[in-house]
């Protein structure tokens, strides 16, 4: 599966939300929905 980035400091990776430290940066993309800052 693809990897999805979030503004709030976690990412969707292998279908799970995993915290990461660095700032995400760009939030360009489609709003996934029912998440925090999730775009793809």
């Amino acid at each position: 599966d693809a990897e999805f980035r979030h503004d709030s400091g976690y990412e969707v990776h292998h279908q799970k939300l995993v915290f990461f430290a660095e700032d995400v940066g760009s939030n360009k993309g489609a709003i996934i929905g029912l998440m925090v800052g999730g775009v793809v």
Epitope: A2, K16, A30, I31, I32, G33, L34, G37, G38
Partner: antibody, heavy 121, light 111 residues
Amino acid sequence: QVQLVQSGAEVKKPGASVKVSCKASGYTFTTYAIHWVRQAPGQGLEWMGFTSPYSGVSNYNQKFKGRVTMTRDTSTSTVYMELSSLRSEDTAVYYCARFDNIDRGYVRDYWGQGTLVTVSS
Amino acid sequence: DIVMTQSPDSLAVSLGERATINCRASESVDNDRISFLNWYQQKPGQPPKLLIYAATKQGTGVPDRFSGSGSGTDFTLTISSLQAEDVAVYYCQQSKEFPWSFGGGTKVEIK
């Protein structure tokens, strides 16, 4: 106003494929992912996956093991969900839906009217 | 995958009385102090409608009699004073991780 309008009911034979469409209007098509949720008769809700009209990237529920494909046509603001190798258990109403993220000042959901797919020999 | 379990399967409540529906997740649906737990109402022949998101926040246009509580793995939807138009099936859903998953539903009827 935001609208998601789905294609009409389908009757398919086991082993066949079905392609359901969801035409979006009333907002910028590429700004929201479109999700697909199905509901077998008298049963609960099951999330199938989503596709991004912006990037074309999709994320699928692995339960469908490669049988599902979600695509989009930005020229017509339409998303498609194709399900292959149909079996009787795939008989269901298929919904497309759009959701806001929860960090918005408001959260709304929009749903298509549903498409009944009947799989029968 | 996260499994969502609702109870009861159905309940009958008198008009004006309180209805309480429970939802349990097989693992925590919290992340960064947010519960990714949502509640939907579905009436016959209609698509679902989002009532509550992030466990406690009301969706747009949802009446104040609907409220949500809980965190981690245990959540509750409360209808404080049941109205005739509240007869429906209610579903919980987690959006913490993919695949999103729903509870089996709770049918609310008038006693």
